[in-house]
């Protein structure tokens, strides 16, 4: 999947653009908004009617090296009595993010962008019921 | 499990792991072969904490289109379709990495940017604060 060129006609390539080899792009890894923090409600993973656990994946050849993945604890949802209600479903909510991978090509090191699908949390949904004729 | 050492008082220094500027292959490797993100496309309507999806478009960013979730209700939807205000619909947020064109309008020069997106909503029991 190639990164699309800028589409609008008024986005002509400015003279100030750095020279880049064919088939490559220049990437500055100094992150904009580096210290931004998630401000989610407290402990929503345990307070949710579709609670989830977190697993940390760690990869020394990836930036960011740490990616946190959620897994729904139950197939059903937790009702007001604290019991699992299997007439409802806990389902994962997912979001794509980019990561940067450091790879080896022969004797040289190269960099590749990868799309990774992160499971962010879970939500409780009414199941889709298929009626058999 | 895996434990990542972390000093909460320090800024994230993980970027020590990568050079400040790198040349990257234009092709983006997509490893999501086993999971179909479209599978969750109707969850926003079927959830007990439903949400609306708002299109955020920015031609200076890759991906240029990001969908932002906004919870429809303060409470959660009951089986009878009514909203239960004893429960709360809350957004699930995620930090993601995107590419920002830098300098602006340049086709093949980018900088990594961390952005916060609301991906969907979940129904939670509220935190009750008892006043003495």
């Amino acid at each position: 999947r190639k990164i699309p060129k800028v589409g609008h006609t008024f986005f002509q390539k400015p003279e100030s653009c750095p020279p880049v080899p064919e088939g490559s792009m220049k990437l500055d890894t100094g992150i904009i908004n580096e210290n931004q923090r998630v401000s989610m409600s407290r402990n929503i993973e345990s307070r949710s009617t579709s609670p989830w656990n977190y697993t940390v994946t760690w990869d020394p050849n990836r930036y960011p090296s740490e990616v946190v993945q959620a897994q729904c604890k139950h197939l059903g949802c937790i009702n007001a009595q604290g019991k699992e209600d299997i007439s409802m479903n806990s389902v994962p909510i997912q979001q794509e993010t980019l990561v940067l991978r450091r790879k080896h090509q022969g004797c040289s090191v190269s960099f590749q962008l990868e799309k990774v699908l992160v499971t962010v949390g879970c939500t409780c949904v009414t199941p889709v019921v298929h009626h058999v004729q | 499990g895996i434990a990542i050492p972390r000093n909460s008082g320090c800024p994230n220094s993980e970027d020590k792991n990568f050079p400040r500027t790198v040349m990257v292959n234009l092709n983006i490797h997509n490893r999501n072969t086993s999971t179909n993100p479209k599978r969750s496309s109707d969850y926003y309507n079927r959830s007990t904490s439903p949400w609306n999806l708002h299109r955020n478009e920015d031609p200076e960013r890759y991906p240029s289109v990001i969908w932002e979730a906004k919870c429809r209700h303060l409470g959660c939807v009951k089986a009878d379709g009514n909203v239960d205000y004893h429960m709360n619909s809350v957004p699930i947020q995620q930090e993601i990495l995107v590419l920002r064109r830098e300098p602006r309008h340049c086709p093949n020069s980018f900088r990594l940017e961390k952005i916060l997106v609301s991906v969907g909503c979940t129904c939670v029991t509220p935190i009750v604060h008892h006043v003495a």
Epitope: T55, T57, W58, D59, P60, N61, R62, S65, E66, V67, Q69, Q71, V99, R101, R102, K103, H104, C107, V109, E114, V116, L117, V118, T119 | I2, I4, P5, S13, E14, D15, K16, N17, F18, R31, N32, S34, T35
Partner: antibody, heavy 117, light 106 residues
Framework: EVQLVESGGGLVQPGRSLRLSCAAS????????MHWVRQAPGKGLEWVSG????????GYADSVKGRFTISRDNAKNSLYLQMNSLRAEDTALYYC??????????WGQGTTVTVSS | EIVLTQSPGTLSLSPGERATLSCRAS???????LAWYQQKPGQAPRLLIY???SRATGIPDRFSGSGSGTDFTLTISRLEPEDFAVYYC???????FGQGTKVEIK
């Protein structure tokens, strides 16, 4: 020839410390992430810790978090594992392994650590 | 915590037969990779397969890996005498190993 040679194992009492070393040769050491994996007698493999090519990122198994520290000296082509507050359950053969991005492609022969009073 | 379950625990086969080893993950993650290792008594593990299906350098083509999501398979098309060993699967990224499958001579 790509080679990894571990050393520093031995018999140690519970609560004491030990430092393992791994000497690498035959490849550009500072280009690769490195790991420690252990195997208790008659048991399976357990990943212990890993470190990126330039020490910028480190990971630890929950079982050793806060007790073990992984480090490397690229100038000496060496990987280390500082093991503190050792327990009987840390008794194992400790392997040093090279990371090839998707797996561990080169392993040493291991060094034995025995924790016993 | 991610668990990799290998089956069967022991596989008793004769040289020339086909061996099929299974590895099931309790959770599938995008950006995690599955590898297979072979270990003989008194020896270090040896990488056979990485990224689910890619053969490591010097590994004979009788070894093949397949699978996706949570179910993975290592197949040895025709067992040679030197293939009798313990085989481990591993999820790179979560750093979990399976408990191993012993392939023994029948």
């Amino acid at each position: 020839e790509v080679q990894l040679v571990e050393s520093g194992g031995g018999l140690v009492q519970p609560g004491r410390s030990l430092r393992l070393s791994c000497a690498a040769s035959g490849f550009t050491f500072d280009d690769y992430a490195m790991h420690w994996v252990r195997q208790a007698p008659g048991k399976g493999l357990e990943w212990v810790s890993g470190i990126s090519w330039n020490s910028g990122s480190r990971g630890y198994a929950d079982s050793v978090k806060g007790r073990f520290t992984i480090s490397r000296d690229n100038a000496k082509n060496s990987l280390y594992l500082q093991m503190n507050s050792l327990r009987a359950e840390d008794t194992a053969l400790y392997y040093c392994a090279k990371d090839m991005v998707y797996a561990l492609d080169v392993w040493g022969q291991g060094t034995t650590v025995t924790v016993s009073s | 915590e991610i668990v990799l379950t290998q089956s069967p625990g022991t596989l008793s086969l004769s040289p020339g037969e086909r061996a099929t080893l299974s590895c099931r993950a309790s959770q599938s993650f995008s950006g995690s990779y599955l590898a297979w290792y072979q270990q003989k008594p008194g020896q270090a593990p040896r990488l056979l397969i990485y990224d689910t299906s890619s053969r490591a350098t010097g590994i004979p083509d009788r070894f093949s890996g397949s699978g996706s999501g949570t179910d993975f398979t290592l197949t040895i098309s025709r067992l040679e005498p030197e293939d009798f060993a313990v085989y481990y699967c591993q999820q790179y990224g979560t750093w979990t190993f399976g408990q191993g499958t012993k392939v023994e001579i029948k």
